[in-house]
């Protein structure tokens, strides 16, 4: 997977009036990395691993960048015509990537009230607009404003791209990111499914990087995809990931089944625990980490694009 830096900024308006402040989150290699603290008006690292990336360096540059971007986005929202009454949001997602062959990619996406209406591939300078008439109108609005604004020239976008890549490279200088390998903890549980059947669940947690193979085997042979259920690979809030795989088997055949895990060149197999069947109250939880933004967005039913 490529290394990536992803900026996620949102500004809000109420009854046509753009609100002060903004919401911002930065992901590094798919992990929550920075968040803009609106109370302290500062960029704050998300968790210990994020703090370790810069060591004892300050987060002044990040604070300055996010503040500038937030201000730009507020101005853009102010230029969107026909804002109906009530709450509205403008969200900008900017991503830059460095691939294994050292090639780079950069893109930018705008969402209004959670709906994508404008995308740009920075390298090719190509803008894309979805088919819907609402998206077309919004895109025309924003593009006209961006053209008017002398700052928003081609040069500006390339500079933004270059800044993003520069920051990403700066973070990658930290061995915490580049050579980070956290092996998963693997745990197999069983629960009663129906008469004569049990569900066996294999959970892998606290691993990094994200790529993992987790599958059930019968007699050493991988079960077909349609007989297994997979959970998403999700951040667990500690700079690592979690996932699970489950299958249904006949009670008494447990010895034939093992969970096979492969991660970062290492592998392991895990048998089904024998003994009394555990009736688990809840399955593997699907945590969607919105880091405090959740409340605002849930309350207003605005979609937060991860």
């Amino acid at each position: 997977e490529p290394h990536s830096l992803r900026y996620n900024l949102t500004v809000l308006s109420w009854d046509g009036s753009v609100q002060s402040g903004f919401l911002a989150e930065v992901h590094l290699d798919g992990q929550p990395f920075l968040r803009y603290d609106r109370q302290k008006c500062r960029a704050k690292p998300q968790g210990q691993w994020a703090e370790d990336v810069l060591g004892n360096k300050t987060w002044d540059r990040e604070t300055r960048d996010l503040t500038g971007n937030g201000k730009d986005l507020r101005m853009t929202l102010a230029h969107i015509k026909d804002q109906k009454e009530g709450l509205h949001s403008l969200q900008e997602i900017r991503v830059c990537e460095i691939h294994e062959d050292n090639s780079t990619r950069s893109s930018q996406h705008f969402y209004y009230d959670g709906e994508l209406f404008l995308s740009q591939n920075v390298e090719t300078e190509e803008w894309t607009v979805p088919q819907s008439s609402r998206a077309q109108t919004l895109a025309m609005n924003v593009r006209n404003f961006l053209k008017e604004d002398a700052m928003k020239t081609k040069t500006h976008y390339h500079a933004m791209h270059a800044d993003c890549l520069q920051e990403l490279r700066r973070y990658l200088e930290s061995s915490v990111v580049l050579r980070r390998r956290v092996p998963p903890m693997v745990n197999v549980t069983r629960s009663e499914a129906s008469e004569g059947n049990i569900t066996v669940t294999c959970r892998a947690s606290s691993f990094y990087p994200r790529n993992i193979t987790l599958t059930w085997r019968q007699d050493g042979v991988s079960l077909s995809h349609d007989t297994q259920q997979w959970g998403d690979v999700l951040p667990d809030g500690n700079g690592t990931y979690q996932t699970w795989v489950a299958t249904r088997i006949c009670q008494g055949e447990e010895q034939r089944f093992t969970c096979y895990m492969e991660h970062s060149g290492n592998h392991s197999t895990h048998p089904v625990p024998s003994g009394k069947v555990l009736v688990l109250q809840s399955h593997w939880q699907h945590h969607h980490h919105h880091h405090g933004l959740n409340d605002i967005f849930e309350a207003q039913k605005i979609e937060w694009h991860e």
């Epitope: 007699d219 050493g220 042979v221 991988s222 010895q255 096979y260 592998h267 197999t269 895990h270 048998p271």
Partner: antibody, heavy 118, light 107 residues
Framework: EVQLQQSGPELVKPGASVKVSCKAS????????IYWVKQSHGKSLEWIGY????????VQNQKFKGKATLTVDKSSSTAYMHLNSLTSEDSAVYYC???????????WGQGTLVTVSS | DIQMTQTTSSLSASLGDRVTISCRAS??????LNWYQQKPDGTVKLLIY???RLHSGVPSRFSGSGSGTDYSLTISNLEQEDIATYFC?????????FGSGTKLEIK
């Protein structure tokens, strides 16, 4: 290339025991099970059991419980089958096999002939 | 235990012939049926797994079919190197069991 190299032929006396080895190469040994199969002279094949080299867990055919013991040595990527209290019924060619994770008995060793005779 | 029956113990065919070897299970094995080739020197190779999936490196003249209890292996264009004994094996239920084998000879 996956290879399973088995130990040479054995001539043993009734009541004695024998240890057949199977050295794996060309893949990560602890990734895949090792299976053992018996073929008596001019007869069909019989599955003895298998071992997971990662954790040493075994699953055996009831018929061979008490007769065959399966072990591995991870450091040398070698699987072993120990046969005890040998009788003429145990005279056979013994094969080890492994999987690619998609099919049983995907790759086979060349076989080890065990002859039990006084 | 599930019995695997290969009714034809030996079969004579000419080079270029289409040959079919059959195998019957004593109960439904849900397509968990594999075919192996054993050469006269004792070398064993997997040909087909899960009824019809061709193992990598196996010539496409080999094919498998069947369901439930009845399965077959077909060699579409018999070659000299196909002279061997063919075994079916079920992987559905423990213990795994093999058919008694079908020895293929050239006329």
């Amino acid at each position: 290339e996956v290879q399973l190299q088995q130990s040479g032929p054995e001539l043993v006396k009734p009541g004695a025991s024998v240890k057949v080895s199977c050295k794996a190469s060309g893949y990560a040994f602890t990734k895949y099970n090792i299976y053992w199969v018996k073929q008596s002279h001019g007869k069909s094949l019989e599955w003895i059991g298998y071992i997971d080299p990662y954790n040493g867990g075994t699953v055996q055919n009831q018929k061979f419980k008490g007769k065959a013991t399966l072990t591995v040595d991870k450091s040398s990527s070698t699987a072993y089958m120990h046969l005890n209290s040998l009788t003429s019924e145990d005279s056979a060619v013994y094969y080890c096999a492994t999987t690619d994770g998609y099919s049983l008995f995907t790759y086979w060793g060349q076989g080890t002939l065990v002859t039990v005779s006084s | 235990d599930i019995q695997m029956t290969q009714t034809t113990s030996s079969l004579s065919a000419s080079l270029g012939d289409r040959v079919t070897i059959s195998c019957r299970a004593s109960q439904d094995i849900g397509n968990y049926l594999n075919w192996y080739q054993q050469k006269p020197d004792g070398t064993v190779k997997l040909l087909i797994y899960y009824t019809s999936r061709l193992h990598s490196g196996v010539p496409s003249r080999f094919s498998g079919s069947g369901s439930g209890t009845d399965y077959s292996l077909t060699i579409s264009n018999l070659e000299q190197e196909d002279i061997a004994t063919y075994f079916c094996q079920q992987g559905n239920t423990l213990p795994f069991t093999f058919g008694s084998g079908t020895k293929l000879e050239i006329k």
